[in-house]
């Protein structure tokens, strides 16, 4: 036989030879890092054709790193479920606690013991420190100097010095979050107030007031003969103005001699985009339709609208 | 066939020493790491101390801590352990054992034990 | 204390299958090793983890676990089994330190 084969856990017992008889014995032991477990063999003979008689490393075991108990408020998950060397521990916190020092550890071979690359890390509480201080305005808990996961604050905003109050731009309710964080930037305070807003040949029909602060809402619609260029309903944004605009109300062209498919009372356009329909070819109507608020109906080609005078 | 024999146990005063020896033979003492065990009279097993193939390696258990010290010679295929302060409480059979490999691993083969009383 | 808990005596009859179990939390991540030992005697190695037995230690004695709790299982019990039984293994302190359970003693009736 020629030399014996070699293994990942066993090594030979004395030096190799580049031959072996018929009958001859080799003796492996377990490697370092290994331990041997009976009752499988761990030798092997060379057989009359010349070749070793099977064996395998199988009772070879690896060793183990020292236990880990799961950190406070956390998780020590050996992967593969293991502690043998070779292997990793992963370390993972309860939700409202984070890890302070390394996520995964190794159980690494020091000589013929196993041992773990570092320290198990440890869960510590998620805390934030008090929320941003906001002009014109508070929080609930001003007075509280730690805050825990999930604890939460609310903004409101002092009373305006002069006839306009302040209004909360914002979410006034944010919480501590999961990497000591809050969960949002503070809202802030400030007078929004929008302009009366003035639609020619259309009427205000909900929203009436004599003041527009921060988030009121005004729906119009144009009087008969006239169709909505723009939107319906506007709402006063942060910087005291309103989004979308002010809509407009524009006259319906008279029907000219080459009637188009009849349409019903309006139809509203939109200035977002172009279509490719403005370089089409073919008749061209004349009028402008009516606008029509009725579901179900196509809005008009606007670069075939917006190309007509 | 593993062979251990344990010597030098005895009587001895509480707070005197007592060195233990282990003579290994039948297997190639270098390359497996070394167990000591004892017994209490009427008592359970205890584990004690762990020393790997080449000495780099010791282990103790709190009990025996700073007062028992485990060594190996290769040269002369024995283990040691060296006992000092020695307590009413050490008094117990105290086994060698060979480990299955290089490190820890399990204790596969035992002596037939040295007894030591502490006792004034 | 021991951190490996096991029962101070069971008893079995004779021919009948008796359950020796450990307890402990290091049992969740490490095999268990098992020794008998008989009044006067040194222990003897008789099982690691689920059936792994040295030769000469009888096809009666097997090896279970589950959870923290480590079983060594006697199928047909006879007189010479009569013994105490230790399990042993790693302790669950995070050092290199092995631990034995209290010991249990079988007695065959």
């Known amino acids: 036989c020629e030399e014996p084969p070699t293994f990942e856990a066993m090594e030979l017992i004395g030096k190799p030879k580049p031959y072996y008889e018929i009958g001859e014995r080799v003796d492996y032991k377990c490697k370092k890092g290994y331990f041997y477990i009976p009752p499988l063999a761990t030798h092997t003979i060379c057989d009359r054709n010349h070749t070793w008689l099977p064996v395998s490393d199988d009772a070879c075991y690896r060793e183990t790193c020292p236990y880990i108990r799961d950190p406070l408020n956390g998780q020590a998950v050996p992967a593969n479920g293991t502690y043998e060397f070779g292997y990793q521990m992963h370390f993972i916190c309860n939700e409202g606690y984070y890890l302070i020092g390394e996520e995964i550890l190794y159980c690494e071979l020091k000589g013929s013991v196993a041992i773990w690359s570092g320290k198990p890390p440890i869960c510590e509480k998620v805390l934030c420190t008090p929320p941003p201080k906001i002009k014109n305005g508070k929080h609930t808990f001003s007075e509280v100097e730690v805050f825990e996961y999930l604890d939460a604050v609310t903004y409101s905003c002092d009373p305006a010095p002069g006839p306009d109050p302040f209004s909360l731009i914002g979410e006034s309710t944010i919480y501590c979050g999961d990497n000591s964080v809050w969960s949002r930037a503070a809202p802030e305070c400030k007078v929004v107030k929008c302009r009366f807003p003035v639609v020619e040949n259309g009427k205000q029909i909900s929203g009436f007031g004599k003041k527009f602060y921060y988030k009121a809402t005004v729906m119009f619609e144009c009087d008969k003969g006239f169709y909505l260029d723009g939107s319906d309903t506007i709402v006063c944004d942060s910087n005291s103005t309103w989004d979308p605009p002010v809509p407009k109300c524009l006259k319906v062209l008279p029907p000219s001699s080459t009637k188009p498919p009849a349409l019903s009372h309006s139809v509203s356009t939109s200035s977002t985009t172009k279509s490719p329909a403005s370089s089409a070819s073919g008749p061209r109507p004349t009028y402008k339709p009516p606008v029509s608020n009725y579901p179900g109906y196509p809005k008009p080609e606007e670069g075939i609208l917006d190309s007509l005078d | 066939q593993v062979q251990l024999v344990e010597s030098g146990g005895g009587v001895v005063q509480p707070g005197r020493s007592l060195r233990l020896s282990c003579a290994a033979s039948?297997?190639?003492?270098?390359?497996?790491?070394m167990h000591w065990v004892r017994q209490a009279p009427g008592k359970g097993l205890e584990w004690l101390s762990f020393?790997?193939?080449?000495?780099?390696?010791?282990y103790y258990a709190d009990s025996v801590k700073g007062r028992f010290t485990i060594s190996r010679d290769n040269s002369k295929n024995t283990l040691y352990l060296q006992m000092n302060s020695l307590r009413a409480e050490d008094t117990a059979v105290y086994w060698c054992a060979k480990a299955s490999g290089y490190g820890m691993g399990i204790l596969d083969y035992w002596g037939q034990g040295t007894l030591v009383t502490v006792s004034s | 204390s021991s951190e490996l808990t096991q029962d101070p005596a069971v008893s079995v009859a004779l021919g009948q299958t008796v359950r020796i179990t450990c307890q402990g939390d290091?049992?969740?991540?490490?095999?268990v090793s098992w020794f008998q030992q008989k009044p006067g005697q040194a222990p003897v190695f008789v099982m690691y983890?689920?059936?792994n037995r040295p030769s000469g230690i009888s096809e009666r004695f097997s090896g279970s676990s589950s959870g923290n709790t480590a079983s060594l299982i006697i199928t047909g019990a006879q007189a010479e089994d009569e013994a105490d039984y230790y399990c042993h293994s790693r302790d669950s302190s995070g050092t290199h330190l092995r631990v034995f359970g209290g010991g249990t003693k079988l007695t065959v009736l």
């Open positions: 020393i790997s193939y080449d000495g780099d390696e010791k």
């Open positions: 983890g689920q059936n």
């Open positions: 039948g297997f190639t003492f270098s390359t497996y790491g």
């Open positions: 290091s049992l969740r991540s490490y095999y």
